[in-house]
């Protein structure tokens, strides 16, 4: 039967008709009393006093209503829920996830989890209505939990007309024996204790740290992972795990050398809605590693679009060497990540200046052999690009990656729709092409142009008449990615390099073969 419920927009909690609740007012000491009336929450301020007994976890401040028994918790940053029991920064689960209190709410099938307080779950063995719900992590939310000591966090989802349990796709903190961090590392509980400069971390309980905020003496030390150890942590929501160090007898802090757990090659792909000559209009969230490189020219004012690029780590962009033949000074270059429209700023875009760029020293500007370049983004810290749904690294391929001939892959870029067009595309495009066998990627197939072992070919193999809209890269796409699915992740196979025209039948595009440059990439990205 259809039920009227209210959803509190501030907390995303759900309430039944006529149910009442208290909620804190953000950035103030006020508390509001709300009740659910015909699907709308009606709220007004009420007087409160400090709670007579502690009821809030993780350093939350408890206040109870003056004239009735309900209470509310003012949660410190990073925590939420009725009793501040939800850790909004937990990006992965440990062991089986019994203690996981994060906010992942997607099942393995991609379905959204159901709120544990939903009346549809009232008869289920595990719901937010249980007397021990808080202890089990259940409540007025739809986050994945493992209340029954199963193998990993799960939730109820509505499918095939009924509610059934399904495991969640929550990342596990330690995959194999990797010691790495997710997100900004506030949930990192590993044992790295060296900084990026190689200095040893000071123990968090060291006497030298007296007077510092983040030490083993902090009231929330346990929740923050601080204690009688010198392991890297991120207690203050910084960019990544860090620790206190002594440098030249001076107390300071440094970021740690903990590797980030890779989320490379993962994305929220949405089916393109619009066909366009040479490909399909796309959203940046489908190609979050796509970069747009702009250059200031000595002769003309302002910046103009130069080439595509590929985000391969927080501070490094891969591109094509031929894009930099004008030898721009690095400060004349700008890199934009997270942009769908070529010249229209995106809501979540990230813009960077370039610290330096490295063009392969054996790049041949006649044949485009070794057509590869690296750009280092400028940043005040050791991190540059912040991961989001529209900005994410692509995976570099394993050295021995050999995909079958005719594997379907995709490229993206802001390049022209066709060779004779005077303009670049106003919007990001994607194109679907297949990898050609090396026997079909030779000089004789490309008008006697030199084709080396550092190149690979890919093209649209559909048969088409003169009006066929064959997918291909085109001018302006150079430096962008050719990616293929490998082990469930989009993996960089080629860098858009050159071609004869665009979208011609039986004429593939030519790409820099990335597997030939893995050692070169590693070598040049060294700290």
């Amino acid at each position: 039967s259809y039920q009227v419920i209210c959803r509190d927009e501030k907390t995303q909690m759900i309430y039944q008709q006529h149910q009442s609740w208290l909620r804190p007012v953000l950035r103030s000491n006020r508390v509001e009393y709300c009740w659910c009336n015909s699907g709308r929450a009606q709220c007004h301020s009420v007087p409160v006093k400090s709670c007579s007994e502690p009821r809030c976890f993780n350093g939350g401040t408890c206040q109870q209503a003056l004239y009735f028994s309900d209470f509310v918790c003012q949660c410190p940053e990073g925590f939420a829920g009725k009793c501040c029991e939800i850790d909004t920064r937990a990006t992965c689960y440990e062991d089986q996830g019994i203690s996981y209190r994060g906010t992942w709410s997607t099942a393995e099938s991609g379905a959204e989890c159901t709120n544990w307080n939903s009346s549809a779950l009232a008869q289920k063995p595990y719901s937010g209505r249980r007397p021990d719900a808080i202890r089990l992590g259940l409540g007025n939310h739809n986050y994945c939990r493992n209340p029954d000591r199963d193998s990993k966090p799960w939730c109820y989802v509505f499918k095939a007309g009924k509610y059934s349990s399904e495991f969640c796709s929550t990342p596990a903190c330690s995959e194999g024996n990797s010691d790495c961090y997710f997100g900004n590392g506030s949930a990192y509980r590993g044992t790295h204790s060296l900084t990026e400069s190689g200095a040893s971390c000071l123990p968090w309980n060291s006497m030298i740290l007296i007077g510092k905020v983040y030490t083993a003496q902090n009231p929330s030390a346990q929740a923050l992972g601080l204690g009688k150890h010198n392991y890297c942590r991120n207690p203050d929501g910084d960019a990544k795990p860090w620790c206190h160090v002594l440098k030249n007898r001076r107390l300071t802090w440094e970021y740690c050398d903990v590797p980030s757990c890779s989320t490379c090659g993962l994305r929220q792909y949405s089916q393109p809605q619009f066909r366009i000559k040479g490909g399909l209009f796309a959203d940046i969230a489908s190609h979050p590693w796509q970069a747009a490189i702009f250059a200031k020219h000595r002769r003309s004012p302002g910046e103009r679009f130069l080439c595509g690029g590929i985000l391969i780590s927080s501070c490094w962009i891969l591109s094509a060497a031929h894009c930099f033949q004008e030898r721009f000074p690095p400060h004349h270059l700008t890199v934009i990540l997270g942009r769908t429209y070529r010249v229209v700023p995106g809501e979540e875009e990230q813009k960077f200046e370039v610290e330096k760029y490295i063009v392969h020293k054996e790049f041949d500007d006649d044949t485009y052999d070794n057509d590869i370049a690296l750009l280092q983004l400028k940043s005040d810290s050791s991190r540059c690009a912040q991961e989001s749904s529209v900005v994410r690294t692509v995976c570099l391929p394993p050295a021995d990656l050999q995909l079958p001939d005719w594997t379907e892959c995709e490229l993206s870029g802001y390049g022209k729709h066709e060779a004779l067009s005077p303009f670049y595309s106003e919007r990001l495009k994607e194109a679907h092409v297949r990898l050609y066998p090396s026997s079909r990627c030779t000089s004789q197939h490309l008008l006697n142009r030199t084709v080396t072992d550092n190149m690979l070919c890919a093209g649209d193999t559909r048969s088409g008449g003169p009006q066929a809209n064959l997918h291909d890269a085109c001018q302006g796409d150079s430096g962008g990615p050719l990616v293929c699915l490998n082990d469930g992740r989009m993996t960089l196979v080629g860098i858009i390099s050159w071609g004869l025209g665009c979208g011609q039948k039986d004429v593939p595009g030519v790409y820099t073969k990335v597997t030939n440059y893995l050692d070169w990439i590693r070598d040049n990205m060294r700290p």
């Epitope: 010691d179 790295h192 060296l194 990026e196 400069s197 190689g198 050398d257 903990v258 590797p259 330096k356 490295i358 020293k361 690296l374 280092q376 570099l396 391929p397 394993p398 050295a399 021995d400 597997t515 893995l518 050692d519 590693r522 070598d523 040049n524 990205m525 060294r526 700290p527």
Partner: antibody, heavy 114, light 112 residues
Framework: QVQLVQSGAEVKKPGASVKVSCKAS??????INWIRQATGQGLEWMGR????????GYAQKFQGRVTMTRDTSISTAYMELSSLRSEDTAVYYC?????????WGQGTLVTVSS | DVVMTQSPLSLPVTPGEPASISCRSS???????????LDWYLQKPGQSPQLLIY???NRASGVPDRFSGSGSGTDFTLKISRVEAEDVGVYYC?????????FGGGTKVEIK
Amino acid sequence: QVQLVQSGAEVKKPGASVKVSCKASGNTSYWINWIRQATGQGLEWMGRIDPGGGSTGYAQKFQGRVTMTRDTSISTAYMELSSLRSEDTAVYYCASYYYAMAYWGQGTLVTVSS
Amino acid sequence: DVVMTQSPLSLPVTPGEPASISCRSSQSIVHSNGNTYLDWYLQKPGQSPQLLIYKVSNRASGVPDRFSGSGSGTDFTLKISRVEAEDVGVYYCFQGSHVPWTFGGGTKVEIK
């Protein structure tokens, strides 16, 4: 911290191959390098392997004779040297590179003798 | 290949006195990414080598501040301000800028 533990000493005949292993614990972010040292001699760099992607770079002197591989599931790197000759008798070290070769294995003595 | 030449070959020292080792490369060892990967390693008798100085002048973790590195281009120096008995061993300079990476021939530091 990174710890590197190498396999035990080997005695091989000329023309044979030897495969030395190096098990890593901790963050081996960049490369595992292989360096050798003949008795009473200096250090000689042989090559490197990226433990993640498996890409390699070898010294020209060993090209065609050396193969560096890794098994990520057990965090182990391997160095195989083929067509052994008496002058390959040496202690073979693995060393992990981050900003330099900050961590070294204990060394593996390979003796080539008929 | 880049040849790294160290001098002296042998260095007898008195505890408490300073010591200096020179290392010269046959060509510039500035990497294409702008860094100079010149390191110093110490191999104590019967042990694996250990890192002392990386990228010309940065002291590795746990290395006493009596060790310092300097230089640029092709000329580099390792200095020990006051030698201690535990500093004996063979010191190697090393370039990691151009493949093949190469070590100097080594300088043996011993107590007089």
